[in-house]
Amino acid sequence: KIGSTENLKHQPGGGKVQIVYKPVDLSKVT
């Protein structure tokens, strides 16, 4: 699923993240 966190391991913060995921947030779609 493109743009989801489905395959993203739960990390304890942004420090070890290798890329920036962008979950599809329908609440922010105007």
């Epitope: 989801s4 966190t5 489905e6 993203l8 739960h10 304890p12 913060g13 942004g14 420090g15 070890k16 993240v17 290798q18 890329i19 920036v20 995921y21 962008k22 979950p23 947030d25 329908l26 609440s27």
Partner: antibody, heavy 120, light 112 residues
Framework: QVQLQQSGPELVKPGTSVKMPCKAS????????ISWVKQRTGQGLEWIGE????????YYNEKFKGKATLTADKSSNTAYMQLSSVTSEDSAVYFC?????????????WGQGTSVTVSS | DIVMSQSPSSLAVSAGEKVTMSCKSS????????????LAWYQQKPGQSPKLLIY???TRESGVPDRFTGSGSGTDFTLTISSVQAEDLAVYYC????????FGGGTKLDIK
């Protein structure tokens, strides 16, 4: 729209436990982390820990290990925090917040807070 | 643990004035892979829940007035309010999310 609904004030006796809900709506519950934050009267914000509802994976502030237990029920889109063996130090407002996990790692939506008073 | 320090602890300014407040972390919050600083700013008005203003040190959250600006990188960060309004009376907190989460002690902004 995104909402995090927390329960009303709790009056609890010292030594007992209290479990408070945070019901999420308006987004995919399993795509975001829920963080919990403590605020004593007139004091600052203190991060307790977080849960990723999809897996149930948790991280805690070392200070709250053994005090707070975080769980999540995917079927009801509700996260819970249980505080055990409460003392007067646990009297505070407790907020839940949606953490924009994987992107900003920032808390973009907050509940209204649950006030806990520990008194005999 | 990452320690966050904010200064000043409080300040009072007149409406229309420019305000800057500082946040320092005990270690760098910059992820060299994503090139992001995992530093956010929150505003908490009296009796309300905190509100996200800035993330990634300088990215304004949707709907936040452009008088609020975040800057800095690594360990030193600043929140600037270019022209303070009466409704900006609040406590402002920085928070790191580089490793776990830690809030600073807050800066209380009063309006003269």
């Amino acid at each position: 729209q995104v909402q995090l609904q927390q329960s009303g004030p709790e009056l609890v006796k010292p030594g007992t436990s209290v479990k408070m809900p945070c019901k999420a709506s308006g987004y995919i519950f399993t795509d975001y982390v829920i963080s919990w934050v403590k605020q004593r009267t007139g004091q600052g914000l203190e991060w307790i820990g977080e849960i990723f509802p999809r897996s149930g994976s948790t991280y805690y502030n070392e200070k709250f290990k053994g005090k707070a237990t975080l769980t999540a029920d995917k079927s009801s889109n509700t996260a819970y925090m249980q505080l055990s063996s409460v003392t007067s130090e646990d009297s505070a407002v407790y907020f839940c917040a949606r953490d924009y996990y994987g992107t900003s790692f920032a808390m973009d939506y907050w509940g209204q807070g649950t006030s806990v008073t520990v008194s005999s | 643990d990452i320690v966050m320090s904010q200064s000043p602890s409080s300040l009072a300014v007149s409406a229309g004035e420019k305000v800057t407040m500082s946040c320092k972390s005990s270690q760098s919050l910059l992820n060299s892979r994503t090139r992001k600083n995992y530093l956010a700013w929150y505003q908490q008005k009296p009796g309300q829940s905190p509100k996200l203003l800035i993330y990634w040190a300088s990215t304004r959250e949707s709907g936040v007035p452009d008088r609020f600006t975040g800057s800095g990188s690594g360990t030193d960060f600043t929140l600037t309010i270019s022209s303070v309004q009466a409704e900006d009376l609040a406590v402002y907190y920085c928070k790191q999310s580089f490793y776990l989460r830690t809030f600073g002690g807050g800066t209380k902004l009063d309006i003269k």
